[in-house]
Structure formats: C-alpha cells, structure tokens
C-alpha cells in the first residue's frame, strides 16, 4: 500500500483584497487516522490556520465536508483577506497518538499573494 | 489591543525555583507560538524559549535541562518554569508573541527575576 | 550558528540629523533580517522586517537596507523619540533565535 501524499496542487495563488481565497490540498489515502492541520509558514513559530479537530476559526470554511466518510479534499477558504494574509500555507496530516497527534506528512506550500482592491 | 502581562518574577537563591506566568488577550492565543526572551541589566537581548501551536518546545542552550515552557489554551496563559537558577539567569522576562515569518510583534513589560545569594 | 555584530556600539548624534546603524550576519541570510527599537524601560518594538519592510505605524524616516550579510537601518532626521537601543534580528525559521549585541543611539 503507498504512503499517504499530501497534495497541495497550486504553488501560488493570488487573490485581492476583500476576496476569499481557497487553498487546495488532497489526501492520496485515508490512513493512518489523524486530523489534518492548515499552518502560515513551515518553522518553529508556524501560525495555526485550521484545525480539523478543535478550535475557533471564524474566517475559515472547509471546501468540503471533511466528516463525510472516505473524504480526502482538505481544502479551505479564507474569506475577506487583506496584505496582512499574505505567506505560505502549509496543509499538514497528523496521525492519532497519545497523549498528542503527531505531524506525518506536510504538503509542499501555497504561496498566497493579495493584490490591491480593484477601483 | 493585544495585551501580554508578566508576573512571578522576584529575588530568590542560586539553586532554587520561580515559575513565570503570561496572560494573553486580544488575540486567539492557541493560534500562536509564543516565547519568552530575557534582558540581563545593561545587556541585549537573549532568546530564552519557544513553545510552538503545537505544544513542541525549544530552548536556548543556557537554559536547557533546567526551564521548561508549557501553555495553557484554555486560560490564554504561557508560563517559565525555572529551575536551578543561577546568577547569570539575573533578568527582565519577556513573554513575546511570535508570527509566522519568526518576528516579534507583541512583547509584554517583562518580569524581573533577580538571583542572589 | 549565525552570529549577527551590530556596530557601532554607540552612536552620538543631534534630532535633525541621520543615523546610520549597521548589523553584519557571519553568513548570508538572503532578506530575512528584523529591526526592533527599545527605549528605557520599555519592551522592544517591531520596526522593519525582510530587510526593508516597516511594520504597522511605523514613520517612513525609518528605512532598512541590504541583502546577503551586510544590513543597514537609516532613520533620517532624528526625533528625539528616536534615541533608544536598535537590535537586529535574523528571521530564520528555526531557534535559536539570533540578536544582534545593539547600537545606542544617544543626543550629542
């Protein structure tokens, strides 16, 4: 059985200010179980965007219904963004541990750029 | 407004204990990493520690094996325990929140921990 | 480990006239460079970032400059709110994160 891929297809995507912007990313499988993770930028100090399991995201919706069963679409939509949302956003795949989830797979990056407001 | 308060520091002895705490608000604190970054008096700036969104955690060398960071989402709070301080650890504390692209944008006004005999 | 020298240590100056600070990286660090402002008893403030970029609030008399290992931070006509201590910091993803020893900017 090959191992999970996480899929981001866009390297870039550039949206303007006060639009939404959808971040795309699939799963190539289903195991191992374990939430899915959307991160602006790849290091230490990494910003949550999504979490799949818990959390307050009030900008954020799910492209699709990630509880539907056999879901491998993580995609997501940012609504009303501004320069201050540009970077690079990270789809991650955690697998179920305890007492913590632990990080299996990162997709490679969408670099999101935000253009001026059209007049 | 994002606001960051520090409290716990104090005078205490080499070899003892002092627990730092932050409390966070004006932002969803669970989202960030956050850090604490000390000042020894009339000295730069030294980065102490990290804890990630994800509750990963890393330490300056001077302080590994004797600081442990730890945060608490459910009360917005970040906290330093420091063990076996020395005198060279004698410091303001400042808890600092960290952005994705590794900047400081929010510092709190810090905690002076003093180690004295 | 990256080492970041700022120079000069101090700098001696009147409000009205230009400051120049500089922060030498002991190896390339493309743009990620950071400057923070620290006044007496305050904690440090956010000025620029990847080099050139002034954060939110922040008067276009601070300007930042360089690329590779050698880093400037101009701030032209000195206010008096101005004198303080300047860090350089390297935005690198990963800690240790590396400040610079500081310049004071001081009224002559």
């Known amino acids: 059985e090959d191992e999970l891929q996480v899929i981001q297809p866009e390297k870039s995507v550039s949206v303007a200010a006060g639009e939404s912007a959808t971040l795309r990313c699939a799963m190539t499988s289903l195991i191992p179980v374990g939430p899915i993770m959307w991160f602006r930028g790849a290091g230490a100090g990494r910003e949550l965007i999504y979490n799949q399991k818990e959390g307050h995201f009030p900008r954020v919706t799910t492209v699709s219904e990630l509880t539907k069963r056999n879901n491998l679409d993580f995609s997501i939509s940012i609504s009303n963004i501004t320069p201050a949302d540009a970077g690079t956003y990270y789809c991650v795949k955690f697998r179920k541990g305890s007492p913590d989830d632990v990080e299996f797979k990162s997709g490679a990056g969408t670099e999101l750029s935000v253009r001026a407001k059209p007049s | 407004d994002v606001q960051l308060v520090e409290s716990g520091g104090g005078v205490v002895r080499p070899g003892e204990s002092l627990r730092l705490s932050c409390a966070a608000s004006g932002f969803t604190f669970s989202n960030f990493a956050m850090n604490w970054v000390r000042q020894a008096p009339g000295e730069g700036l030294e980065w102490v520690s990290l804890?990630?969104?994800?509750?990963?955690?890393y330490y300056a060398d001077s302080v590994k094996g004797r600081f442990t960071i730890s945060r608490d989402n459910s009360k917005n709070t970040l906290y330093l325990q420091m063990n076996s301080l020395r005198a060279e650890d004698t410091a303001v504390y400042y808890c600092?929140?960290?952005?994705?692209?590794?900047?400081?944008?929010?510092w709190g006004l810090g905690t002076l921990v003093t180690v004295s005999s | 480990e990256i080492v970041l020298t700022q120079s000069p240590g101090t700098l001696s100056l009147s409000p009205g006239e230009r400051a120049t600070l500089s922060c030498r990286a002991s190896q390339p660090i493309d743009s990620y460079l950071a400057w923070y402002q620290q006044k007496p008893g305050q904690a440090p403030r956010l000025l620029i970032y990847n080099t050139v970029t002034r954060a939110t609030g922040i008067p276009d008399r601070f300007s930042g400059s360089g690329s590779g290992t050698d880093f400037t931070l101009t701030i032209n006509r000195l206010e008096p709110e101005d004198f303080a201590v300047y860090y350089c910091q390297h935005q690198y993803d990963w800690p240790p994160y590396i400040f610079g020893g500081g310049t004071k900017v001081e009224i002559k």
């Open positions: 804890i990630s969104v994800t509750a990963t955690t």
């Open positions: 600092a929140k960290v952005t994705w692209n590794n900047l400081f944008d929010y």
